[in-house]
Interface confidence: medium
């Protein structure tokens, strides 16, 4: 119930300049970047420019359920997956399957999450257990980031305000704060 089927609705993103968050560790640890062969231009050409806005990457929508143990969200949530490849905008067609991917031989440009949105979801549990609510942070947009050899694994896992994590902060529904209500939640929290 994790990674659902992707819709084929890639969107080309022209990134802005400035600070970029780090890619999520799951992209770094266990997933191979989908790098294709050289698109035909000399490899040095587009990567000598200083203008990051010349590069773009893809946003792929995917749908999944939020789960916690046996509990699952009543409805799936939809967020973006940022594809691992960045290249000159003119070489990245807006539809999957057209044109050629650019394979840079210079600095590595990675397509990573940029902005997030928060969404509260209701989790339904089996066996008569009370529903749980969670507040998840979902990727809302992507951007390109230039990675250098100094971006080691630990740096790629630093999660800040806009750090690249699909979810953050488990947040159950608002609750009363009386001792009795508090105890009831302790008994039903999971």
């Amino acid at each position: 119930q994790g990674w659902q089927a992707f819709k084929n609705d890639a969107t080309e993103i022209i990134p802005e300049l400035g600070e970029y968050p780090e890619p999520p560790p799951e992209l770094e640890n266990n997933k191979t970047m989908n790098r294709a062969e050289n698109g035909g231009r000399p490899p040095h050409h587009p990567f000598e420019t200083k203008d990051v806005s010349e590069y773009s990457c893809r946003e792929l929508h995917f749908t999944r359920y939020v789960t916690d143990g046996p509990c699952r969200s009543a409805k799936p949530v939809t967020e973006l997956v940022c594809s691992g490849q960045c290249g000159p905008a003119r070489l990245l067609p807006n539809a999957i399957g057209r044109g050629k991917w650019w394979r840079p031989s210079g600095p590595d440009f990675r397509c990573i999450p940029d902005r997030y949105r928060a969404q509260r979801v209701q989790l339904l549990c089996p066996g008569g257990e009370a529903p749980r609510a969670r507040k998840v942070r979902l990727v809302a947009s992507c951007k390109c980031k230039r990675l250098t050899r100094f971006h080691n694994q630990s740096e790629l896992k630093d999660f800040g305000t806009e750090a690249a994590r699909p979810q953050k902060g488990r947040k159950p529904r608002p609750r009363a704060r009386s001792a009795k209500a508090n105890q009831a939640e302790l008994e039903n929290a999971y």
Epitope: Q1, G2, W3, P25, E26, N30, R64, V66, T67, D68, G69, A118, R134, K135, V136, R137, F159, G160, T161, A163, R165, P166, Q167, K168, G169, R170, K171, P172, P174, R175, R177, N182, E185, L186, A189, Y190
Partner: antibody, heavy 125, light 108 residues
Framework: EVQLVQSGAEVKKPGASVKVSCKAS????????LHWVRQAPGQGLEWIGR????????LYDPKFQDKVTMTTDTSTSTAYMELRSLRSDDTAVYYC??????????????????WGRGTLVTVSS | DIQMTQSPSSLSASVGDRVTITCSVS???????LHWFQQKPGKAPKSLIY???NLASGVPSRFSGSGSGTDFTLTISSLQPEDFATYYC?????????FGGGTKVEIK
């Protein structure tokens, strides 16, 4: 740098109250639960409770229900924990910690990914 | 409350040794709810492993975790000087959250 910055050490008399602060740096405090954990000298870790800074919702370990009050001020990205009716056995280092929710390979995880450096509260007559 | 029992409570080892710490849980929990922390004297705990076997940010690969149900293990394949510390397991299966009593790893 993502961090939780806690207030300095306190020395209090028995029966007094103390308010410890925990300021979030470089992340949106409303996106996370903040928890408080204490550690008496030479002892292990003990969970006190947590607060949702977004709406002030709290959950305490029942044994601390009458001892603590957790609050937040989102305008300053700061969480507070007030300890009342202090006794000598409340002497401990009090830590705040951020609860992170991480989705990976189809599984969700919740764990403390960032901790404050701790605030030593000494209760002595 | 779920009780967490760590063993041993302390151990002496040398650099290069393989060290194993166990955490026994009083009731069955999901593997994604079991975490390990490292704490050095005068410092805050540091996340080491989350969800039984996933290394937290910046944690060396000599650390590993395993287990399921009620029995979980933290292993340090080759102890390094900076690994001498106290290690805690913690469950997130139900409130109140609880920690193991800790295992102090000392230099032999």
């Amino acid at each position: 740098e993502v961090q939780l910055v806690q207030s300095g050490a306190e020395v209090k008399k028995p029966g007094a109250s103390v308010k410890v602060s925990c300021k979030a740096s470089d992340f949106n405090i409303k996106d996370f639960y903040l928890h408080w954990v204490r550690q008496a000298p030479g002892q292990g870790l003990e969970w006190i409770g947590r607060i949702d800074p977004e709406n002030g919702d709290t959950l305490y370990d029942p044994k601390f229900q009458d001892k603590v009050t957790m609050t937040t001020d989102t305008s300053t990205s700061t969480a507070y924990m007030e300890l009342r009716s202090l006794r000598s056995d409340d002497t401990a280092v009090y830590y705040c910690a951020r609860e992170a929710d991480y989705f990976h390979d189809g599984t969700s995880y919740w764990y403390f990914d960032v901790w404050g450096r701790g605030t030593l509260v000494t209760v002595s007559s | 409350d779920i009780q967490m029992t760590q063993s041993p409570s302390s151990l002496s080892a040398s650099v290069g040794d393989r060290v194993t710490i166990t955490c026994s849980v009083s009731s069955t929990i999901s593997s994604n709810h079991l975490h390990w922390f490292q704490q050095k004297p005068g410092k805050a705990p540091k996340s080491l492993i989350y969800g039984t076997s996933n290394l937290a940010s910046g944690v060396p690969s000599r650390f590993s975790g395993s287990g399921s149900g009620t029995d979980f293990t933290l292993t340090i394949s080759s102890l390094q000087p900076e690994d001498f510390a106290t290690y805690y397991c913690q469950q997130w299966s139900s409130y109140p959250l609880t920690f193991g009593g800790g295992t102090k790893v000392e230099i032999k």
